[in-house]
């Protein structure tokens, strides 16, 4: 009879075991285990009747189609075999074991005791057949196996071969190299590769196979397994395979498709091709006079580009437009996209006007072309070139006037300072009475008129100031402070300020320059209680033209000490002589209280301690700070007064031979101006030099050398 066994392990014994088996018996055990396993059989006990070639009693182990072993007897002889320690392995998942005893047993034989178990098949080691083995990597597990692929490959649907995704290759460059995947290593199986060469219309693709050409073929049938096909429009070239590469192919098209097919077997190295775009040839080019063509080639084809440039000092001229370079291109029809342009000498054109300056041409005929030369100079004696620049500019290859130091920037004509067109009288030890100033004696003197029209009725007052540059006036902060304030310091609105320069006689303003204010800047620390930091600036709406009657005064060096005691200085102003008169009377014409003609006075600087003492002895809270100095005479008689406020107290600087503003008329009192032992108090300008430069937006070094030279 037959016993079906499906367990993963088990025991098989001869009938009646461990007693002797009966005669004339036949039993078959069919063992089936799952796929991926094989059956291992071994015997723990074996005792059967011996016979030649196991004719009588035996145990036969077989598969569906093959006998694996036949056992009988007790020990192995030449003609009979016992299992002993031998293990029987089935090739597959099925094993059949048949026990047979004949009709007579001379002795008592105990039979056999056998065990079986399912053991895993290592498919990765045992598969020799290429059709079944993994293409790249094999992974065994109990009961089965699976395949995987190298990086860049994809497992085919057959779960065995490794293919590549290579259907999306686009080539747009004019030359290139295309190869089978992994070239020169064997190409992947089961792959469909598509390579597209797509060039601009006008080009034609030429193909050339190179190096190795090795595609699986067949001796009789043309390319049944692996092949290359080349598709040009509707026309298909190929298939190509084997070891002989196709001849060079001129496609006559700008668009080419290359198809490469591989099946699931074979180990071939593949192929490599280079492609090149060909186009129409364009005529030979001649470079322009004073110019060159790049790149310089014997022949030019479609899409070749050339750059036309000119020698230094020349510009490309095309259709009356100047440019640095001009590019032309070889077109698909074999013509150039443009004619070769000409090279024209660079022209810097008329040089820029220099404010307060002049231009002279060094080159004949006032030429403004490449390498021509011009010279800027300043309107002397009122302006001087900053940093003593040469003022020489050359027409550069870039078409701009260039200076060795300043580059393309124009020089700066700075106002000369502290040099009146008329010499001030030599200073004497004793004061001579206030006197009329000749025109041009104090060219920095400014009359500042403030008319606050925002109040009804209007407020109106005036003061003096000193011109520092073509755009800036230095004055006292209290002149430009809104008067309707108690202790707060608010500047007057710039719209309410008018500045007169070059004014000599207030009755005749026709010769003067009047300017409105663009900015009013009071010192941020100005104190209305004690007039400390009594300094301010007015920026004029437009720079004023300098001349014999309008010139700036120089600023001093930064010196905390200020002017030395007993030094004589000059102050000018249209200040009033009668302090009880109102400003309306002062400003209205015909009044005698305002001096019509600019007056000036010489005053000595008073030692600081003496001045402090003279004010401390008075009733009232007077404070002469380190930001102030005093000038005047103990016996009085000459002084500055109302209306002179903000005017410059100037001292001649022997080093620079210029007049320097050391003080600004600030305050005095409480007695009448010019009273005995009532010194005028002046803002010490040398303490504010940095602040002034900062407000004017100029570095100190710009102007200081003029004072120190």
């Amino acid at each position: 009879h037959t016993v079906e066994l499906n367990n993963m392990f088990g025991q098989i014994q001869s009938p009646g075991y461990p007693d002797s088996y009966p005669s004339d018996s036949e039993v078959t055990w069919n063992i089936t285990v799952p796929d991926g396993f094989r059956i291992k059989l071994y015997f723990m006990h074996f005792n059967l009747e011996s016979s030649y070639l196991c004719e009588y009693d035996y145990v036969k182990v077989e598969t569906e189609d093959q006998v694996l072993a036949t056992f009988c007897g007790r020990e192995t002889t030449d003609t009979e075999q016992t299992p002993g320690q031998e293990v029987v392995l089935s090739p597959g998942s099925f094993m059949s074991i048949t026990f047979r005893s004949d009709f007579s047993n001379e002795e008592r034989f105990t039979g056999f005791d056998a065990h079986y178990m399912a053991v895993d098949v290592d498919e990765c080691k045992e598969r020799e057949d290429e059709e079944l083995s993994c293409d790249h990597y094999c992974h065994n597990y109990i009961g089965g196996y699976y395949c995987s692929c190298r990086f860049g490959y994809i497992l085919h649907t057959d779960n065995r071969t490794c293919r590549v995704e290579c259907s999306d290759n686009l080539f747009t460059q004019r030359t290139g190299v295309i190869t089978s995947p992994d070239f020169p290593n064997p190409y992947p199986k089961s792959s469909e590769c598509l390579y597209t060469i797509e060039l601009e219309e006008g080009f034609m693709v030429n193909l050339q196979f190179e190096d190795i050409f090795d595609i699986e073929d067949h001796p009789e049938v043309p390319c049944p397994y692996d092949y290359i096909k080349i598709k040009v429009g509707p026309k298909v070239l190929g298939p190509f395979c084997g070891e002989k590469a196709p001849e060079p192919i001129s496609t006559q098209s700008h668009s080419v498709l290359i198809l490469f097919h591989s099946d699931n077997s074979g180990e071939n190295r593949g192929w490599r091709l280079s492609y090149r775009a060909a186009g129409n040839e364009c005529p030979e080019l001649q470079p322009p006079v004073h110019g060159k063509i790049e790149p310089s080639q014997a022949k030019y084809f479609f899409k070749d580009q050339v750059l036309v440039s000119c020698d230094t000092g020349y510009k490309v001229l095309k259709d009356n437009v100047e440019m640095d370079t001009f590019q032309i291109e070889c077109l698909k029809d074999g013509t150039w996209s443009n004619k070769i342009p000409t090279c024209k000498i660079v022209d810097c054109r008329a040089p820029g006007e220099l404010e307060h300056g002049l231009i002279t041409f060094s080159t004949r005929n006032n030429l403004t072309t490449y390498k021509s030369e011009i010279k800027y100079s300043c309107q002397e004696p009122y302006y001087k070139m900053l940093n003593n620049n040469t003022g020489i500019y050359t027409c550069s290859a870039q078409g701009v006037w260039m200076n060795k130091v300043l580059g393309r920037s124009l020089p700066t004509c700075l106002p000369e300072c502290g040099q009146p067109s008329r010499s001030l009288p030599s200073l004497v030890k004793r004061i001579i009475g206030g006197r009329n100033a000749e025109p041009g004696l104090f060219p920095w003197q400014a009359l500042i008129v403030v008319e606050d029209t925002s109040r009804v009725p209007n407020d109106k007052w005036f003061g003096s100031g000193a011109l520092l540059s073509a755009s800036w006036i230095l004055t006292a902060a209290h002149v430009l402070r809104s008067q309707r304030r108690d202790t707060t310091v608010i500047p007057v609105s710039k719209e309410h300020v008018t500045v007169y320069l070059g004014l000599h006689d207030v009755r005749d303003k026709s010769g003067a320059v009047n300017s409105s204010a663009a900015r009013v800047v009071l010192h941020p620390d100005f104190n209305i209680q004690n007039y400390n930091h009594d300094i301010a600036l007015v920026q004029l709406q437009e720079p004023v033209p300098l001349g014999p009657h309008v010139m700036p005064v120089c600023l001093p060096r930064l010196e905390p000490e200020g002017p030395a005691p007993h030094m004589l200085g000059l102050v000018a102003g249209w200040g009033i002589s009668n302090p009880n008169v109102t400003v309306d009377e002062i400003i209205s014409s015909g009044t005698r209280t305002l001096s019509d003609v600019l007056q000036y006075v010489k005053l000595p600087v008073v030692p600081h301690a003496e001045c402090k003492t003279s004010y401390e002895s008075r009733s009232g809270n007077y404070s002469v700070t380190e930001n102030m100095f005093c000038a005047g005479y103990y016996e009085g008689g000459k002084d500055t007064c109302l209306g002179d406020s903000g005017g410059a107290f100037v001292i001649f600087d022997d080093l620079s031979q210029r007049w320097v503003v050391q003080g600004l008329v600030s305050w005095g009192g409480p007695e009448e101006c010019g009273s005995k032992q009532v010194y005028g108090v002046y803002t010490k300008v040398s303490n504010y030099v940095d602040w002034v430069w900062e407000q004017m937006g100029l570095p100190q070094s710009v102007v200081e050398p003029q004072v120190e030279r």
């Epitope: 309707r484 108690d486 707060t488 400003v583």
Partner: antibody, heavy 113, light 112 residues
Framework: QVQLVQSGAEVKKPGASVKVSCKAS????????IEWVRQAPGQGLEWMGE????????DYNERFKDRATFTADTSTSTAYMELSSLRSEDTAVYYC??????WGQGTLVTVSS | DIVLTQSPDSLAVSLGERATINCKSS????????????LAWFQQKPGQSPKLLIY???TRESGVPDRFSGSGSGTDFTLTISSLQAEDVAVYYC????????FGGGTKVEIK
């Protein structure tokens, strides 16, 4: 002619705000200060502050700094005074003044619950 | 802030007689730069807006009768009506023009 015309009388509840307008004509509105002065019933004049319409600059009496806001619309030549957190003692006639010389007709603001 | 003290609080004067009102300031109102005293006088008739009479302590506003005059400097100022007319019955205020501006308490002028 040169004049200042103010908005009409207002009745407000305590805690509310009031905005009085003052329309100028006959002169350059932007260039002159507009002052605000109030007068409680049977009382004297009290200066509240001022605005220069062209620049928007303002000055406030400290008493009103936290509650009063002066603004000006130059396109319509109109100045505004807004007083917030009203209380009964804010009941007064409010005047706008062109820098002392020209007075509006006044706006009575009554604050009552 | 500058305080202005007006005296008397009220004043009864016969028609044609002189009326004098005083205004005292807690601070000097003279500005040495503009040479002006920033003090003004206003008249307010019942039910009307105030009207400017005098500015800068002594300058009469245009259209104001010359019987009105102002005087004083520094801290002490006076408004004088040289010959009182019936239409002059009003409350008169002084005002100083340093920010913050302030008014005097007012003086009521009546006909005796």
């Amino acid at each position: 002619q040169v004049q200042l015309v103010q908005s009409g009388a207002e009745v407000k509840k305590p805690g509310a705000s009031v905005k009085v307008s003052c329309k100028a004509s006959g002169y350059t509105f932007t260039g002159k200060w507009i002052e605000w002065v109030r007068q409680a019933p049977g009382q004297g004049l009290e200066w509240m502050g001022e605005i220069l319409p062209g620049s928007g600059s303002t000055d406030y009496n400290e008493r009103f700094k936290d509650r009063a806001t002066f603004t000006a619309d130059t396109s319509t030549s109109t100045a505004y005074m807004e007083l917030s957190s009203l209380r009964s003692e804010d009941t007064a006639v409010y005047y706008c003044v062109r820098s002392e010389d020209l007075w509006g007709q006044g706006t009575l603001v009554t604050v009552s619950s | 802030d500058i305080v202005l003290t007006q005296s008397p609080d009220s004043l009864a004067v016969s028609l044609g007689e002189r009326a004098t009102i005083n205004c005292k300031s807690s601070q000097n109102l003279f500005n040495s730069r503009t040479r002006k005293n920033y003090l003004a006088w206003f008249q307010q008739k019942p039910g009307q807006s105030p009207k400017l009479l005098i500015y800068w302590a002594s300058t009469r506003e245009s259209g104001v009768p010359d019987r009105f005059s102002g005087s004083g400097s520094g801290t002490d100022f006076t408004l004088t009506i040289s010959s009182l007319q019936a239409e002059d019955v009003a409350v008169y205020y002084c005002k100083q023009s340093y920010i913050p501006f302030t008014f005097g308490g007012g003086t009521k002028v009546e006909i005796k």
